[in-house]
């Protein structure tokens, strides 16, 4: 149990060509019961705890007090082999005929039962005195995960018998548990790369490689940290891990030098209004450093002189910005630039964009309201407001008239075409006050309303009116 013993990798049919452990019959062919194998191990399960006992348990029932002790035979203690080799080992036990109840032999590894993905065969050698049982276990192409302590269990007369362990130590090429990772670095600034590989066998020594040339003449013990004092151009780094079994090379990683971003491309106008433009763009290559923010530059395209450039800053994402506070019906040149930690990109190609026409900025002037009693209508006149080019083309007016009398309130509006500067509206209520306001309309929208003009509609023929479009509130002039 506690000492290491001879083991050679042999074929299953040669495994017991020499003397077998314990008593085995001559002239008896064994009969075998292969354990079922599955393609995959089951999910990991917690090994059950069992009370410690000796290999020769004391059976307590009176009927079996005279039974001889039963235990697994001594077997090899330690197997060392290379990864991808095949391995075979066994447990054997002699069960006298006096034992009536025996169960199959199960294989365990590090406290967990092995239920599949391995090949195990149990062979029985019966004779007059009892049966010798040999449980053969083989693993094809061992991997590191096969490392462990293996042992057999068997129930005899309801008592669990456990073999001594067989330590299986799998050695192989170094195995990386931490490989260098691609990083983006500032020019001429120091940075670190880490490489860690393990055996067995240990130790594992590390050589660093930069652009196919070794960096360190002497190997470093794993784990190794390489401090690179700085780079001026992109480089590829890898590490070599060496142990007694050979060499494993890590993936090669690109170390990129951070530069300013490339200019944005595909600057597009998604929407325009009279005073805003919604612009989108595709960011250029980030220069190996995340884009931090972008700048939208806007200048008036119509100006002959060097018009000042308006600059609007926004976050790098989303790649969208609404430029506001622009003039209506104006042409603009727009470009975008973005920056990372290194600096600003060049600006994108300039594109042309236009705002749409705006709404009028002033109300109609000189509003007068007359009551035409004979026709029972209000006659309203005004002066066309001074509309700028960017306010667009006048298409008409909106007249708002509100009628108030005791217990009655009526708010109405009319739209009239731009032809002429007068309109007539029917009287809605007598013995009331009518308040009139007028706004100009262009394709860009409706402008501001004029100051209210009040007129009192009498029950009969008495009329007050206000000729001014901008009276003090409540002011009226009599006709």
């Amino acid at each position: 149990g506690g000492t290491a013993e001879k083991w050679e990798e042999t074929e299953l049919d040669q495994l017991f060509s020499g003397p077998l452990p314990g008593r085995l019959p001559v002239n008896h062919r064994p009969f075998s019961a292969p354990h079922s194998s599955r393609d995959q191990l089951p999910p990991p399960q917690t090994g059950r705890s069992h009370p410690a006992h000796t290999a020769a348990p004391q059976v307590t029932s009176t009927a079996s007090k005279l039974l001889p002790p039963v235990a697994f035979n001594h077997t090899i203690g330690h197997i060392v082999l290379s990864e991808h080799k095949n391995v075979k080992f066994n447990c054997s036990i002699n069960i006298p005929n006096t034992y009536q109840e025996t169960a199959g032999i199960s294989w365990w590894k590090d406290g967990k039962e092995l239920l599949g993905a391995h090949h195990s065969i149990t062979q029985f050698y019966p004779d007059e005195e009892g049966v010798s049982i040999i449980a053969l276990f083989s693993i094809a192409s061992v991997q590191r995960s096969d490392n462990g302590s293996y042992f057999c269990k068997m129930k005899v007369n309801n008592r669990e018998i456990v073999s001594d362990p067989i330590y299986v130590e799998v050695q192989g090429l170094p195995y990386f548990i931490k490989q260098p990772e691609s990083v983006n670095v500032t020019r001429n600034t120091a940075f670190n790369l880490t490489c860690q590989a393990v055996g067995p066998p240990e130790p594992v020594n590390i050589f660093w490689v930069q652009n196919s040339s070794r960096v360190n003449e002497k190997p470093e013990r794993s784990p190794s940290v390489l401090t690179v004092p700085g780079l001026t151009e992109t480089a590829v780094f890898s590490c070599e891990a060496h142990n007694d079994k050979g060499l494993t090379v890590s993936k090669g990683v690109h170390i990129n030098i951070k530069v300013i971003p490339s200019p944005p491309t595909e600057v597009h106008i998604l929407n325009s209004t009279a005073h805003s433009i919604l612009v989108s763009w595709v960011p250029g290559f980030d220069g190996y450093s995340p884009l931090q923010n972008c700048s939208i530059q806007v200048k008036e395209a119509d100006r002959l002189s060097n018009g000042s450039v308006m600059v609007f800053n926004t976050s790098a994402s989303p790649h969208l910005y609404e430029i506001q506070q622009l003039q209506a019906l104006a042409n603009y040149s727009i470009a975008v630039s973005c920056r990372n930690e290194i600096g600003w990109s060049a600006v994108s190609p300039w594109i042309l964009a236009s705002t749409t026409e705006g709404a009028p900025s002033v109300a109609p002037l000189n509003i007068t309201v007359f009551l035409n009693e004979s026709n029972n209508i209000l006659d309203i006149r005004w002066t066309k407001p001074p509309i700028k080019r960017q306010d667009g083309e006048l298409v008409g007016y909106r007249i708002s008239h509100v009628w108030e009398s005791a217990g009655t309130y009526k708010e109405l509006s009319e739209e009239v075409s731009q032809n002429g500067s007068w309109a007539q509206i029917p009287v809605q209520i007598h013995n009331a006050t009518c308040t009139v306001r007028i706004a100009a309309i262009t394709k860009g929208g409706i402008g501001p309303f004029s100051e209210p003009v009040n007129i009192i509609i009498p029950e009969h023929s008495k009329v007050d009116y206000a000729p001014s479009s901008t009276p003090a509130p409540g002011n009226t002039d009599s006709m």
């Epitope: 410690a52 290999a55 001594d164």
Partner: antibody, heavy 118, light 112 residues
Framework: QDQLQQSGPELVKPGASVKISCKAS????????IHWVKQRPGQGLEWVGW????????KYNERFKGKATLTADTSSSTAYMQLSSLTSEDSAVYYC???????????WGQGTSVTVSS | DAVMTQTPLSLPVSLGDQASISCRSS???????????LHWYLQKPGQSPQLLIY???NRFSGVLDRFSGSGSGTDFTLKISRVEAEDLGVYFC?????????FGSGTKLEIK
């Protein structure tokens, strides 16, 4: 992290017995041998014996047969060594250690000091 | 029993020097499986022994490459290429090829 935690120091009278413990954690206790090692003050190391907790099998150094008894309780992942008929020669630090896959004593307990004095 | 004779008992060294410790067995430690179960341990003052080298020449996980082991059969050597202050303590060899397992008497590495 594989670990072995031993019980605290013991002061016992000659002729008495003492039972010291070694609690394992971080690995399958029933799968690896536990060895016991004696170290007298200012002296070398002496192998006492081993136990395989999975089945209770033991092996002793002839010099410690009748002196040391090794047991294990798998439910608590604890190995024990009982020393009987103590004399001043048994005053020492006793270590438990795991026989790892590499077939070396790879992890050791911190040691238990046993002082035999009247 | 396999008797392990370790020399020297005491080894005074200067920091940065190389140290060499020998361990000789009264019988061959090579097992029939071709492995030699000779291990080296360091015991620092007030601490448990810690594994340095297993099976003659394999460094245990975390052991620095200043430590190396060599030998075969009955004669084995532990070398420390550049002694540092943290290396001070008592070094033992241990054989686990034969029962009973046996330790060397120990070599105390100390500063000159």
């Amino acid at each position: 992290q594989d670990q072995l935690q031993q019980s605290g120091p013991e002061l016992v009278k000659p002729g008495a017995s003492v039972k010291i413990s070694c609690k394992a954690s971080g690995y399958s206790f029933t799968s690896y041998y536990i060895h016991w090692v004696k170290q007298r003050p200012g002296q070398g190391l002496e192998w006492v014996g081993w136990i395989f907790p999975g089945n209770g099998n033991t092996k002793y150094n002839e010099r410690f047969k009748g002196k040391a008894t090794l047991t294990a309780d798998t439910s608590s992942s604890t190995a024990y060594m009982q020393l009987s008929s103590l004399t001043s020669e048994d005053s020492a630090v006793y270590y438990c250690a795991r026989l790892g896959l590499i077939y070396a004593l790879d992890y050791w307990g911190q040691g238990t000091s046993v002082t035999v004095s009247s | 029993d396999a008797v392990m004779t370790q020399t020297p008992l005491s080894l005074p060294v200067s920091l940065g020097d190389q140290a060499s410790i020998s361990c000789r067995s009264s019988q061959s430690l090579e097992n029939s499986n071709g492995n030699t179960y000779l291990h080296w341990y360091l015991q620092k003052p007030g601490q448990s022994p810690q594994l340095l080298i297993y099976r003659v020449s394999n460094r245990f996980s975390g052991v620095l490459d200043r430590f190396s082991g060599s030998g075969s059969g009955t004669d084995f050597t532990l070398k420390i290429s550049r002694v540092e202050a943290e290396d001070l303590g008592v070094y033992f060899c241990l054989q686990v090829t034969h029962v009973p397992f046996t330790f060397g008497s120990g070599t105390k590495l100390e500063i000159k």
